[in-house]
């Protein structure tokens, strides 16, 4: 059941010409690297996972979401230093006892081979060669992503 | 000190024509409401603060950042029901013992009159009439924002 504000919002929006929607990201902004249909920003500084999530959000982007093993490998190929860890948008959901991407989907167990424990306050980082479970309070770098493909007709799922 | 990957990224980007940068958000996407130079999305569902932050991030947006009292009032005018609470992008930083926006800036004490305690695990919600400190685990609605102004020449601060 939608509140009046939501009905109002939907009415206003649906009465508008849909071609006025967001034109999408045609090219990557300065300092962002293109990787296929995404723009990636590798942080210079370190933060716990939650602050990294907030940083990407304020940049109107998301902590990195990795679709499959192929995307993981291509992302890892951009990491030059073997020892550096980067947060991605995956953490352990205690209530669901599973790894959960920040978009709400669960990890397909075949996608990533995670080193470390699946437990409370665990978040996922990637290095040049591996995927690690770390305490979310650990201060490491992080990767933000923006979708590069135009999102003109992208309708966000009901939040 | 920049890593080789970051130097490489900067070199690649600076050699590109800067007009290829993100054209910005010219109009609000469907279901989003325009409020001055922002697009706002009022959620339909409920979540703790952290999940709300993640939701906005995956929508390539930010939990609402409020510049001043005037913007607060205009946002509150969009809320129809007096009792409904919405998360915004402000929470209590225990280490700094202060309210902190998710973009890293601190609350100007004159901006918002917060009802409730400034303590660990406290996050800020707004209603039609007030600003409340609630436990961050409280499951309520939330507001995401996208900047409407073109960000062609916007260079993200060193992250």
């Amino acid at each position: 059941q939608k509140s009046s504000i939501e009905k109002c919002s939907v009415d206003i929006q649906q009465s508008r010409n849909k071609t006025t929607e967001r034109p999408g990201l045609l090219n990557c902004p300065i300092y962002w690297q293109q990787l296929r249909e995404k723009c990636l920003l590798f942080s210079h500084t370190v933060n716990p996972w939650n602050n990294s999530l907030a940083d990407c959000s304020t940049k109107e982007s998301s902590l990195l979401l990795i679709r499959d093993k192929d995307e993981l490998i291509h992302t890892q190929n951009l990491i030059r230093d073997k020892a550096i860890l980067f947060w991605i948008g995956l953490n352990f959901s205690l209530s669901e006892k599973n790894w959960k991407w920040i978009n709400g989907s669960f990890l397909n167990s075949n996608d990533l081979e995670i080193r470390g424990d699946a437990k409370e306050n665990s978040c996922i980082s990637i290095s040049q060669t591996s995927v690690y479970s770390e305490y979310c309070s650990t201060e490491i770098r992080w990767i933000c992503q923006k979708e590069l493909t135009p999102v003109r007709n992208k309708v966000y799922p009901d939040s | 000190q920049k890593s080789s990957i970051e130097k490489c990224s900067v070199d690649i980007q600076q050699s590109r024509n800067k007009t290829t940068e993100r054209p910005g958000l010219l109009n609000c996407p469907i279901y989003w409401q325009q409020l001055r130079e922002k697009c706002l999305l009022f959620s339909h569902t409920v979540n703790p603060w952290n999940n709300s932050l993640a939701d906005c991030s995956t929508k390539e947006s930010s939990l609402l950042l409020i510049r001043d009292k005037d913007e607060l009032i205009h946002t509150q005018n969009l809320i129809r029901d007096k009792a409904i609470l919405f998360w915004i992008g402000l929470n209590f930083s225990l280490s700094e013992k202060n309210w902190k926006w998710i973009n890293g800036s601190f609350l100007n004490s004159n901006d918002l009159e917060i009802r409730g305690d400034a303590k660990e695990n406290s996050c800020i919600s707004i209603s039609q009439t007030s600003v409340y400190s609630e436990y961050c685990s409280t499951e309520i609605r939330w507001i995401c924002q996208k900047e409407l102004t073109p960000v062609r020449n916007k260079v993200y601060p060193d992250s």
């Epitope: 209530s95 | 009792a83 409904i84 609470l85 919405f86 409730g116 685990s137 499951e139 609605r141």
Partner: antibody
Framework: QVQLVESGGGLVQPGGSLRLSCAAS????????MSWIRQAPGKGLEWVSY????????AYADSVKGRFTISRDNAKNSLYLQMNSLRAEDTAVYYC???????????????WGRGTLVTVSS | DIQLTQSPSSVSASVGDRVTITCRAS??????LAWYQQKPGKAPKLLIY???VLQSGVPSRFSGSGSGTDFTLTISSLQPEDFATYYC??????????FGGGTKVEIK
Amino acid sequence: QVQLVESGGGLVQPGGSLRLSCAASGFTFSQYYMSWIRQAPGKGLEWVSYISPSGATIAYADSVKGRFTISRDNAKNSLYLQMNSLRAEDTAVYYCARSLMSTGTHLYFDLWGRGTLVTVSS
Amino acid sequence: DIQLTQSPSSVSASVGDRVTITCRASQGISSWLAWYQQKPGKAPKLLIYAASVLQSGVPSRFSGSGSGTDFTLTISSLQPEDFATYYCQQVTSFLPYTFGGGTKVEIK
């Protein structure tokens, strides 16, 4: 239609246990804080416990803490109250109640079941 | 715990009368207050929330006011179906949620 239906009440001896259930229908159960509230015969209302939409946050009145356990199954649209170590003073009609959506832990109960009577007596 | 004191505990009134019930909180609760109506053998019904917001479907003769510690429920013109017991409830984040002792509105 939108409703809550409690079940599981009955007569139990002091020290015994009961499990109350509440079946929800007609609304998106997983989006609401749910509570149990009781009313002793001829007396006023007493809030017993609440559970958040995801089940992650739970609270109890001091009078039942350590003895009662609230839980929910969003897939089954059901709320539960496991009552152990029952006492005579737990005798009451137990209501399942829904809170207004998105007022967080400020629980205004906008939908109530008809209640189920729990009698604790030897 | 936050105590809520309702007064009067009972009131006798006639159809058409204006009835006022008060609820006093032992400490400030902002506008986090609700009013319920309960008839014998029935579950309570939400009338007012956030101190003054009329719940959907509730007749406009019911109104609520107040903030902080002092609150009022007013029935502008009592109808036969309004004879019942009325409870206030505080819903701050300070647990437990507490109800007032109730006010019984009886036929004069």
